[in-house]
């Protein structure tokens, strides 16, 4: 999905007032220096591909992100302000379903929500020179 | 306007199923989560599950695990709820209500209005 | 699970009086996820207060809603007579979805 005609501004309220609160939620008990961030992202478009990517594509050590609140309110954020992209995802899904399993929150799970904080934080300051 | 209209109200016998319609128009409806809420005589709400038009994704409460399926027919813009093994415990009012972001905090913004379910032999 | 705790389970008030409803949650939510719908004989919910204190819209001012945490509460400072309802708390921080059990605002 290309995500450059989505409604950056409106995501990123939706991420602040909400979403944010609820990654803080999942990694609680965990200190902010715990992971190095490793992901990053160079604009909105590409910050939206990575954020999608980490919060629904099973990974080796954490299948189970997809079933999270956080997850749930970014998937609605996507499809509300990125036009067609709830269509995109049919195909995707599909695929993916048999893979997903429920809330085991590994260590590895934890550290991908680290560097998808990274990411929204990154996506919420589109102007400044990447590192 | 946003508006969800469900079917019409239902008597069953225990041990069988129920599915209960949700007729969504006024908005992109495979944009929208849409959940089901339901109230037996008296009680109060209990949130029963979710799914996601778009793909057909769920999230059921464990509570009715293995009892209560969502689907939803894009084609129609109508998502559905079925739930089997009834037992008089299940007689209630059944309720769909989307999921939408409301100045940006996420909550059940539209509700439908109600189908009563009656379990009884 | 996150369980909602409302209290009292029934408010008796005269109109022009002010009810405070109660909602107590099992563990710490963030304020965004706190929401209380209003539920009137026979009808379906309506939502009332949105992330613990933005009223849904055309929603009047005498009700208000505030708290942080694990306590969260609803105000109506001068009860009208339309006001007279059962109201619901509900989290929206973690699976599965809760509410609170309702506090029916009766009229004394």
């Known amino acids: 999905y290309d995500f450059t005609n989505c409604d950056f501004e409106k995501i990123k309220a939706a991420y602040l007032s909400t979403i944010s609160k609820d990654l803080i939620t999942y990694m609680s008990g965990t200190k902010s220096t715990e992971f190095n961030n490793t992901v990053s992202c160079s604009n909105r478009p590409h910050c939206l591909t990575e954020i999608q990517s980490l919060t629904f594509n099973p990974t080796a050590g954490c299948a189970s992100l997809a079933k999270e609140m956080f997850a749930m309110k970014t998937k609605a954020a996507l499809a509300i302000w990125c036009p067609g992209y709830s269509e995109t995802q049919i195909n995707a899904t599909q695929a993916m379903k048999k893979r997903r399993k429920r809330k085991v929150t590994t260590n590895k799970c934890l550290e991908q929500v680290s560097q998808l904080q990274g990411l929204w934080r990154r996506f919420n300051r589109p102007l400044l020179k990447q590192q | 306007q946003v508006q969800l209209v469900q079917s019409g109200a239902e008597v069953k016998k225990p041990g069988a199923s129920v599915k209960v319609s949700c007729k969504a128009s006024?908005?992109?409806?495979?944009?929208?989560?849409m959940n089901w809420v339901r109230q037996a005589p008296g009680q109060g709400l209990e949130w029963m599950g979710q799914?996601?038009?778009?793909?057909?994704?769920?999230n059921y409460n464990g509570k009715f695990k293995g009892r209560v399926t969502m689907t939803r027919d894009t084609s129609t813009s109508t998502v559905y709820m079925e739930l089997s093994s009834l037992r008089s415990e299940d007689t209630a009012v059944y309720y769909c209500?989307?999921?939408?972001?409301?100045?940006?905090?996420?909550?059940?913004?539209?509700w439908g209005q109600g189908t009563t379910v009656t379990v009884s032999s | 699970e996150i369980v909602m705790t409302q209290s009292p389970a029934t408010l008796s008030v005269s109109p022009g009086e002010r009810a405070t409803l109660s909602c107590s949650v099992s563990?710490?939510?963030?304020?965004?996820?706190l929401h209380w719908y209003q539920q009137k004989p026979g009808q379906s919910p309506r939502p009332w207060i949105y992330?613990?204190?933005t009223l849904a819209s055309g929603i009047p001012a005498r009700f208000s809603g505030s708290g942080s945490g694990t306590e969260f509460t609803l105000t109506i400072s001068s009860l009208q007579s339309e006001d007279f309802a059962v109201y619901y708390c509900?989290?929206?921080?973690?699976?599965?979805?809760?509410f609170g059990g309702g506090t029916k605002v009766e009229i004394k």
């Open positions: 209500a989307r999921g939408g972001y409301v100045n940006f905090l996420y909550a059940m913004d539209y």
């Open positions: 006024g908005y992109a409806f495979s944009s929208y989560w």
């Open positions: 799914i996601f038009p778009g793909d057909g994704e769920t």
């Open positions: 563990s710490s939510i963030s304020s965004s996820n």
């Open positions: 992330g613990t204190s």
């Open positions: 509900q989290q929206w921080s973690s699976y599965p979805l809760t």
